[in-house]
């Protein structure tokens, strides 16, 4: 016989030869990271037809790590199913909790044991700090030191002390989250007051206050005969100014070869502009829209 | 609190100019919102228009091609320049502070009386 | 421009009475209507913003209400101090337009 077979898992016991006579026999064992299950055979003869009888490495079997359980709130997952060596450990905690040490352990052999490569984590509950102080303003739960994943504060604005009261400029409620961090940065508490929109040769059609605070927001149309130029919809931004700019009405051109001043809105545009009150979905100046308005 | 006062007014021949002038005081003229308006027993109160504090101008479409709103900041003053008078124009001329940006008029002062006749 | 129609022109009432004035925009005017009152000799000075909303300084006595095209401005018991021209004013649209004025004396 030439050359007995190979395996992944176990070895020849003693130095090959090139060839063997009808009847030897040979030895294999386990390889270095696998050790030996009985019944199967673990040698071979050479038969007379000049082959080698069956044999396999199935009653060798890989070095295993030991068993692993679960961290307390939370899993340990076996990445290909088995404790053997060479398998991958992935650990993950449950909602609210953090991880502290190594997130994936692998099953490595060292001389002829398997073993883990480090410590398994931990897994320990999501804390927060108490959330900013601001100016102006409170949190919910001031008096609180630690908090927990989800817990959440909402902030609100102290009463101003003069006419204009204080406005909320960002998030009111945020919450302990992920890697013990507010979801949101502290809002911030101060007067946000827009100037009156005056509109030459227009007039505002929608959003009437007294006076404009945070977020307010003003539609506007213009006269017969005149165009917007900029949006008909602006909003008092957090620096007291609107957003986009206050528009302007400009008189429409009514020469053909006169190209009226750009307007706001993308892509081409005609020469001749009729006067906004013409335009779809704008209510006619005859129509009296400010008629018996309850602000 | 800043106080406004008038002064320029007088005796004007029809046809005449006259330059008014509002002076601020305890205050920068630039930092407030300054609209001219006028009183007289035949044609009531009118509003002439206003400067805002960015140097941007309104008015009424009425007075635009003769009267014109200006301002020197280095000299603290707002002017209410009037060319082509008529007799109609005499009256009493106040300036007066918009209200923090809002189209009410809470701060009058004197007013200043011009007068257009031959 | 908007007009403003004040009636009645002239009134004239007893000290502790309630006194009504109205002011008609000839187009809907939203709740953009100032009241002044310009006391004998004096500069006018301002009472109601917005509608309703008293001017710091000016006594509780005075109110206003309306909306759209009708305004009112009420005097709940009228005082002597009270004797004037009364204005209302538009800034709805420019130009910002007052009333021709109701004179109120008392008897």
């Known amino acids: 016989c030439e050359a007995p077979p190979t395996f992944e898992a176990m070895e020849l016991i003693g130095k090959p030869k090139p060839y063997y006579r009808v009847g030897e026999r040979v030895d294999y064992k386990c390889k270095k990271g696998y050790f030996y299950i009985p019944p199967l055979a673990t040698h071979t003869i050479c038969d007379r037809n000049h082959t080698w009888l069956p044999v396999s490495d199935e009653g060798c079997y890989r070095e295993m790590c030991p068993h692993i359980r679960d961290p307390l709130n939370g899993e340990a997952i076996l990445a290909n199913g088995s404790y053997e060596f060479g398998a991958e450990l992935h650990f993950i905690c449950n909602e609210g909790y953090y991880l502290i040490g190594k997130d994936i352990l692998y099953c490595e052999l060292k001389d002829t044991v398997a073993i883990w490569s480090g410590k398994p984590p931990l897994c320990e509950k999501i804390l927060c700090t108490p959330p900013p102080k601001i100016k102006n303003g409170k949190h919910t739960f001031s008096e609180v030191e630690v908090f927990e994943y989800l817990d959440a504060v909402t902030y609100s604005c102290d009463p101003a002390p003069g006419p204009d009261p204080f406005s909320l400029i960002g998030e009111s409620m945020i919450y302990c989250g992920n890697n013990s961090t507010w979801s949101h940065a502290a809002p911030e508490c101060k007067v946000v007051k827009c100037r009156f929109p005056v509109v030459e040769n227009g007039k505002q059609i929608s959003g009437f206050g007294k006076k404009f605070y945070y977020k307010a927001t003003v539609m506007f149309e213009c006269d017969k005969g005149y165009y917007l130029n900029g949006s008909d919809k602006i909003v008092c931004e957090s620096n007291s100014t609107w957003d986009p700019p206050v528009p302007k009405c400009l008189k429409v051109s009514t020469s053909p070869t006169t190209k009226s001043p750009t307007s706001s809105a993308s892509g081409p545009r005609p020469t001749y502009k009729p006067p906004v009150s013409n335009y779809p979905g704008y209510p006619k100046p005859d129509e009296g829209i400010l008629n018996n308005l309850d602000d | 609190e800043v106080q406004l006062v008038e002064s320029g007014g007088g005796l004007v021949q029809p046809g005449g100019s006259l330059r008014l002038s509002c002076a601020a005081s305890?205050?920068?003229?630039?930092?407030?919102?300054i609209s001219w308006i006028r009183q007289s027993p035949s044609r009531g109160l009118e509003w002439l228009g206003v400067?805002?504090?960015?140097?941007?101008?309104n008015y009424n479409s009425a007075f635009m091609s003769r009267f014109t709103i200006s301002r020197d900041d280095s000299k603290n003053t707002a002017y209410l320049q009037m060319n082509s008078l008529k007799t109609e124009d005499t009256a009493v001329y106040y300036c007066?502070?918009?209200?923090?940006?809002?189209?009410?008029?809470?701060?009058w002062g004197q007013g200043t009386l011009v007068t257009v006749s031959s | 421009a908007i007009q403003l129609t004040q009636s009645p022109s002239s009134l004239s009432a007893s000290v502790g009475d309630r006194v009504t004035i109205t002011c008609r925009a000839s187009?809907?005017?939203?709740?953009?209507l100032n009241w002044y009152l310009q006391k004998p000799g004096q500069s006018p000075q301002l009472l109601i913003y917005?509608?309703?909303s008293l001017h710091s300084g000016v006594p509780d006595r005075f109110s206003g209400s309306g909306s759209g095209t009708d305004f009112t401005l009420k005097i709940s018991r009228v005082e002597a101090e009270d004797v004037g021209v009364y204005y209302c004013?538009?800034?709805?649209?420019?130009?910002?337009?007052f009333g021709q004025g109701t004179k109120v004396e008392i008897k």
């Open positions: 007066e502070r918009v209200y923090d940006g809002y189209p009410w008029f809470a701060y």
């Open positions: 305890g205050g920068s003229v630039s930092s407030y919102d």
């Open positions: 400067i805002w504090t960015d140097g941007g101008t």
């Open positions: 187009q809907g005017i939203s709740n953009y």
């Open positions: 917005y509608t309703s």
């Open positions: 004013q538009q800034y709805i649209k420019l130009p910002w337009t």
